[in-house]
């Protein structure tokens, strides 16, 4: 299973100091799911890690980057079937002998605990309960992410009093 989808648009302006201010809406595109400050898109097919990376690019997004354990937990809470795995944007850099996120940063030791080998052609996937390494050529579903985009609310100020 996968998370219920279709609930993307949320007004997250927390600090309204004046009732005459026009709120800004942070919106996920249609079909994307909002999780905190990100929009996530879960694939409905399977691919090796490289293909997954490329496919997210076609959606002007990237494979999922996980900043900390809290974000990992939030994402895993969306996975309702323990048998399903998703590629994320982390793989092993042979030259630097370390796990490397696709944004160029390295995995810090207290971020995620990866079960499995740290070796050439290893990529990382998440399941409902864990984080694993696997050959990058393995076929899995994947998760794309993009940042929430700011959309000016065109509603008159009185409408949200």
């Amino acid at each position: 299973q996968k998370p219920s989808i279709g609930k993307c648009s949320v007004d997250i302006q927390q600090n309204r100091t004046k009732t005459t201010e026009r709120p800004d809406l942070l919106n996920c595109p249609i079909y994307w799911q909002q999780v905190q400050e990100k929009c996530l898109l879960f694939s409905h097919t399977v691919n090796p890690w490289n293909n997954s990376l490329a496919d997210c690019s076609t959606k002007e997004s990237s494979l999922l980057l996980i900043q900390d354990k809290d974000e990992l937990t939030r994402t895993q809470n969306l996975i309702h079937d323990k048998a399903i795995s998703f590629w994320i944007g982390l793989n092993f850099s042979l030259s630097e002998k370390n796990w490397k996120w696709i944004n160029g940063s390295f995995l810090s030791s207290n971020d995620l605990k990866i079960t499995g080998d740290a070796k050439e052609n290893s990529c990382v996937y998440i399941s409902q309960t864990s984080v694993y390494s696997e050959y990058c050529s393995t076929e899995m579903k994947w998760i794309c992410q993009k940042e929430l985009t700011l959309v000016r609310n065109k509603v008159s100020p009185d409408s949200w009093l």
Epitope: Q1, L41, S43, H44, T45, D81, E139
Partner: antibody
Amino acid sequence: QVQLVQSGAEVKKPGASVKVSCKASGYSFTGYTMNWVRQAPGQGLEWMGLINPNTGGTYYNQKFKDRVTMTRDTSISTAYMELSRLRSDDTAVYYCARLGDNYRGYFDSWGQGTTVTVSS
Amino acid sequence: DIQLTQSPSFLSASVGDRVTITCKASQDVGTAVVWYQQKPGKAPKLLIDWASIRHTGVPSRFSGSGSGTEFTLTISSLQPEDFADYFCQQYSTYLYTFGGGTKLEIK
């Protein structure tokens, strides 16, 4: 235009296997995931699994995982679904169906269906 | 598994009628619902995706609505070619499931 043409009707005995083919035309075969769905007489539709024709990667409905094999031959733009250890309740029309989008689970083109009858 | 219950199972109507078919999900599926039309002996044809988005080439008399657990397909003015079976599908989970279908017949 997009066309999915399936192989002809099959009659099989219980315990046998059946292999159904689905030839695609009118689009890039490797660009769209192929699914298999079946419809038993008087019953609803049941999703069986998918294959990514570009890579050969598969994902199956757990119900069929031990009996189904999905393959493809990109040189002839054809997907295959083989179901083994057939039982009488496998009697159904089997459809191939193209996934319309990598990120949504709808089927925008279907084959004409292949009737598989399992009878002793 | 998510169960989809369609109602009615059978529907008799006349050309020009407005008809509504309902699909109820056993749990929240967001808007990840699809509607198909199927004529006897033919393959299903995609009508609507994401609960309300008409597929390319589908006449405007077909419309879909709903979210969560209750969805409707409406045909605003029945045409002779609309008499067929209709069924819904959810893809909120990776185990795609389908409704039992609604047979739309000429009165």
